[in-house]
């Protein structure tokens, strides 16, 4: 199953993320799930994940830095939290889960760029 | 003539980049001419050029915003004052300017991203 | 570090049942999908069945659809294939292994026999 | 369900030697295809993932190249360790499934 990515994203100066991942799905779904994996050197690590139902929205765990939606078979991720040592490459992932058969989906990765602000001068 | 830049360049919070341009000399150049274009779309427009001779100091224009220092055949540039809107692809061009033959060399180019930041809040 | 380790086999009678376990252990065990692939004597590797994450969604190869079934206890690491109506053809080596993020199966147990005779 | 057809069923070569095995794909899997190699009595182990990504702790003389229905696993250099069962696999969709494998061994 094809999955689009944009290939570059900067962070904002807040560390914030956003990108678009897309997903060309080859049946009718109603459970999929979207994971954010990082990928440094040879290493890939989840970042986070969630399972959705078609038409339902993208629930994260409390605890993630992840948030999103969907809409049809795109899903907008939002990363927050992200310092310059977070500079990485970030794959999308998404499973068809139901109904059978599943299928699994790759992108091909979105190198996200982090700069750690300058501190602001201390008030007088 | 071959020249080698890094391909991609984070700017810093503080608008400043900087990255490296090597070139292969062909022959023993005493006078070379280094010139950083940017590239956005199709049009291609110089940021800041200088001249200098082999083993002395690089030295750009007072009002220009490159710095620069040079080792052999390796030339440390640096930009400043940049802004986000300032992101794009900044190509190193290298000239042999003296003695004759004129050889001249340019780079793939290398992406400077550039994030603004946030504005600290007003001191009371 | 990662470990997969079955138990569970030996031999049994034909259309009588048997229960493997599959003990994780070293990783997040309910970030990873867990396969069983089988291996008969001298043959080639055979996919028997998948579960996923939370467990509530499962695979299996026709088979053994009807007679198997894969499931698992987050809280414990196991993973689990209740084997029911066995047959001749059931006899093999009975793998688990972890799905890496990726999708391929990038850990695997070193197995457990599974002998049905009369 | 997707068929997996390697090729050849054996391969006879001697230490050194280069060692080239196909698996072609009933249908496209796109890039999710793995390589496992299998010693006599003991679970397969990834080598190639993705098509062509080797697995963590895999010598770089083990290649993967193709995508579609078209796939190579090329051993550059036979070592004496390689001599075993390579099988690929499909994970891009269930059923999931293996080919039925290539022995390679020493002529």
């Known amino acids: 199953m094809h999955v689009a990515q944009p290939a570059v994203v900067l962070a904002s100066s807040r560390g914030i993320a956003s990108f678009v991942c897309e997903y060309a799905s080859p049946g009718k779904a109603t459970e999929v799930r979207v994971t954010v994996l990082r990928q440094a050197d040879s290493q890939v690590t989840e970042v986070c994940a969630a399972t959705y139902m078609m038409g339902n929205e993208l629930t994260f765990l409390d605890d993630s830095i992840c948030t999103g939606t969907s809409s049809g078979n795109q899903v907008n991720l939002t990363i927050q939290g992200l310092r310059a040592m977070d500079t990485g490459l970030y794959i999308c992932k998404v499973e068809l889960m139901y109904p059978p058969p599943y299928y699994l989906g790759i992108g091909n990765g979105t190198q996200i760029y982090v700069i750690d602000p300058e501190p602001c001068p201390d008030s007088d | 003539m071959h020249v080698a830049q890094p391909a991609v360049v984070l700017a810093s919070s503080r608008g400043i980049a900087s990255f490296v341009c090597e070139y292969a000399s062909p022959g023993k150049a005493t006078e070379v001419r280094v010139t950083v274009l940017r590239q956005a779309d199709s049009q291609v427009t110089e940021v800041c050029a200088a001249t200098y001779m082999m083993g002395n100091e690089l030295t750009f224009l007072d009002d220009s915003i490159c710095t620069g220092t040079s080792s052999g055949n390796q030339v440390n540039l640096t930009i400043q004052g940049l802004r986000a809107m300032d992101t794009g692809l900044y190509i190193c061009k290298v000239e042999l300017m003296y003695p004759p033959p004129y050889y001249l060399g340019i780079g793939n180019g290398t992406q400077i991203y550039v994030i603004d930041p946030e504005p600290c809040p007003d001191s009371d | 570090q990662v470990q997969l380790v079955e138990s569970g086999g030996g031999v049994v009678q034909p259309g009588r049942s048997l229960r493997l376990s599959c003990a994780a252990s070293g990783f997040t065990f309910s970030s990873h999908g867990i396969h069983w692939v089988r291996q008969a004597p001298g043959k080639g590797l055979e996919w028997v069945a998948v579960i996923w994450y939370d467990g509530r969604n499962k695979d299996y190869a026709d088979s053994v659809k009807g007679r198997f079934t894969i499931s698992r206890d987050n809280s414990k690491k196991t993973l689990y294939l209740q084997m029911n109506s066995l047959r001749a053809e059931d006899t093999a080596v009975y793998y688990c292994?972890?799905?890496?993020?990726?999708?391929?199966?990038?850990?695997w147990g070193q197995g457990t026999l599974v002998t049905v005779s009369s | 369900e997707i068929v997996l057809t390697q090729s050849p069923g054996t391969l006879s070569l001697s230490p050194g030697e280069r060692a080239t095995l196909s698996c072609r794909a009933s249908?496209?899997?796109?890039?999710?295809l793995a390589w496992y190699q299998q010693k006599p009595g003991q679970a397969p182990r990834l080598l190639i993932y993705g098509a062509s990504s080797r697995a963590t702790g895999i010598p770089d003389r083990f290649s993967g190249s193709g995508s579609g229905t078209d796939f190579t696993l090329t051993i550059s250099r036979l070592e004496p360790e390689d001599f075993a069962v390579y099988y690929c696999?499909?994970?891009?969709?269930?059923?999931?499934?293996f080919g039925p494998g290539t022995k390679v061994d020493i002529k």
């Open positions: 249908q496209s899997v796109s890039s999710y």
């Open positions: 696999q499909q994970y891009g969709r269930s059923p999931f499934t």
């Open positions: 292994a972890r799905v890496a993020p990726l999708g391929p199966l990038d850990y």
